[in-house]
């Protein structure tokens, strides 16, 4: 059955002369026989024997797409009238790395658009990229097979020290941004609050003018700054950040009262509303959702439900007043 | 040291009512949410139902809305849960849970058996 | 709903051996600022369940470190090393990244 019934109307192609009737006849034994579909790509009307003039129509296996154009004609002679046609991938394969590097989100299959990010071990770094996008069938940039993780700059020159510090004899110093920042480290996108604005720093510069008291400097993300959620939720933490009386150093980050420090990664990871102990004084009056009646959340609710990316409406700071 | 102790739960008939209740000691009891956690024969472990600090907030699986209410009493450091219109596939053991910032359920009651037959 | 799905369903050690078992999740348990919430608790015999592992792969208070988590996306692992006669119970996975909190069905570990 089908929607585009064929009452023998003489139909032309945009691409040919000649109507279907006015067709050779032919004798029933004579047309075409069943076509080779290309790889990973199916006949959908499938049948031993095709009348001449008749069309096949060429489907791909899921997680391919046709490119070209997807119909055979069949021809008086007994062969087929086949433009460039072929199933592309619509998804990219796993990647295969080197085992000690991590591929993050772990899946079999992603597809177009979506992205993954490599780590390596605590003291280690990506000797190349970290993240990657499925484009079309394949990774955006390329990943090669022989990319391994180097030991990590910064951590050889910390020695004792804390991040973005050095040892100097027996003591921690700054590290300069100048001097000691010219091999390479992971990007990192960073917040800006003099010049109220986001760009990609080298983690060593970073620690290093954060360690020199440029307190106006906030850790956004691993990576490079890319438009997103990612970074939409780190300008939201770091305004949210000035009236937190939590703030605890992790990794390159700096963790508040909405977040814990995850002591396997070294990221703060935002805790779920649950999870917020009652105390603190840093109260905000809100609106959840589409919901009209307002509600009184400390800090680490607020921080919780934003991070979670719920709909929630500040009023004001401190209680609601009804 | 944390405690939660629930009430002892019992046999039902489909249709009929219980209410649990879990008393809590060794910390500030307003100070957090709480939630309800069942573990039955053929579903294993299942989320019930979560309460804010004080009440104003509750939150239940699909399956229990409009038939539990999960409520609370600071004064008297104590988590109730009202169960109504019983099924059958509410039978389990039923745990009160408390969490921390490592879990949603970090501290956990020794549980209350529920079965609910005719 | 999440289905986490767990491997196998039982397993059967001897002490001083080591064992994975494997959490799959039906959707990515990533979300869209990075975080991953996924635990593993372990329930002895006759016992609550206990926190041994969260956010994947940090270590609950009072948990040896022969147990270890690790994964990514939706495919989680619990490695005990090294396991001991008091390890024996039925290990959860339990997701809170997408409402509702759902858990998977268990693993049992037997000592031979």
């Known amino acids: 059955f089908s929607i585009m019934e064929n009452n023998g109307q003489p139909c032309i192609n945009d691409d040919e002369e000649m109507k279907e009737v006015d067709l050779p006849e032919i004798e029933a034994d004579s047309g075409c026989p069943q076509p080779v579909p290309p790889e990973n790509g199916f006949i959908r009307n499938e049948k031993q024997l095709y009348l001449v003039g008749e069309d096949v129509e060429i489907s791909c296996l899921t997680g391919f797409e046709t490119v070209g154009y997807q119909y055979f004609r069949c021809l008086p002679d007994g062969t087929w009238r086949q433009g460039d046609v072929e199933c592309q991938r619509t998804e990219c394969i796993k990647p295969v790395v080197q085992e000690v590097l991590t591929i993050t989100p772990f899946q079999r299959l992603y597809r177009i658009g979506e992205s993954i990010e490599l780590t390596c071990p605590k003291g280690f770094v990506v000797a190349g990229p970290s993240r990657y996008t499925c484009q079309g069938n394949s990774w955006t940039p390329p990943i090669s097979n022989s990319l391994t993780c180097e030991k990590d700059t910064l951590t050889k020159l910390k020695g004792h020290c804390q991040l973005g510090q050095k040892q100097s004899g027996s003591e921690c110093i700054c590290m300069s941004p100048e001097e000691d920042c010219s091999h390479h480290s992971e990007d990192l996108c960073v917040f800006d609050t003099d010049s109220n604005d986001y760009f990609t720093s080298p983690a060593c510069k970073f620690l290093a003018e954060k360690c020199l008291n440029n307190q106006q400097l906030h850790f956004l993300h691993i990576g490079s700054c890319q438009d997103g959620r990612q970074l939409e939720w780190g300008l939201e933490r770091t305004r949210l950040s000035s009236n937190s009386t939590k703030k605890e150093s992790c990794g390159y980050d700096t963790c508040y009262d909405w977040e814990k420090c995850s002591a396997s990664t070294s990221k703060c990871v935002c805790l779920l509303p649950p999870q917020c102990f009652k105390g603190g004084n840093q109260l905000y009056c809100v609106k959840m959702g589409s919901s009209t009646s307002e509600k009184t959340l400390n800090i680490c609710e607020v921080g919780t439900i934003r991070c979670a990316n719920r709909k929630m409406e500040i009023l004001h700071p401190g209680k609601c007043l009804a | 040291e944390v405690q939660l102790v629930e009430s002892d739960g019992g046999l039902v008939q489909p249709g009929g009512s219980l209410r649990l209740s879990c008393a809590a000691s060794?910390?500030?009891?307003?100070?957090?949410?709480m939630a309800w956690v069942r573990q039955g024969p053929t579903k294993g472990l299942e989320w019930v139902a979560t309460?804010?600090?004080?009440?104003?907030?509750?939150y239940y699986r699909e399956s229990v809305k409009g038939r539990f209410t999960i409520s609370r009493d600071n004064a008297k450091n104590t988590l109730y849960l009202q169960m109504d219109s019983l099924r059958a596939e509410d039978t389990a053991v039923y745990y009160c849970a408390r969490p921390s910032t490592e879990a949603l359920f970090a501290y956990w009651g020794h549980g209350t058996l529920v079965t609910v037959s005719s | 709903d999440i289905v986490l799905t767990q491997t196998p369903l039982t397993l059967s050690v001897t002490p001083g051996q080591s064992v994975s078992i494997s959490c799959r999740s039906s959707?990515?348990?990533?979300?869209?600022?990075?975080?991953?919430?996924l635990y593993w608790y372990l329930q002895k015999p006759g016992q609550s369940p206990q926190l041994l592992i969260y956010?994947?792969?940090d270590l609950g208070s009072g948990v040896p470190n022969r147990f270890s988590g690790s994964g990514s996306g939706t495919d989680f692992t619990l490695k005990i090393s090294r396991v001991e006669a008091e390890d024996v119970g039925v290990y959860y996975c339990m997701q809170a990244s997408h409402a509702p909190y759902t858990f998977g069905a268990g693993t049992r570990l037997e000592i031979k």
């Open positions: 959707q990515s348990l990533l979300n869209d600022v990075g975080n991953t919430y």
């Open positions: 060794g910390f500030t009891f307003s100070d957090y949410y």
């Open positions: 309460i804010n600090y004080d009440g104003s907030s509750t």
């Open positions: 956010l994947v792969s």
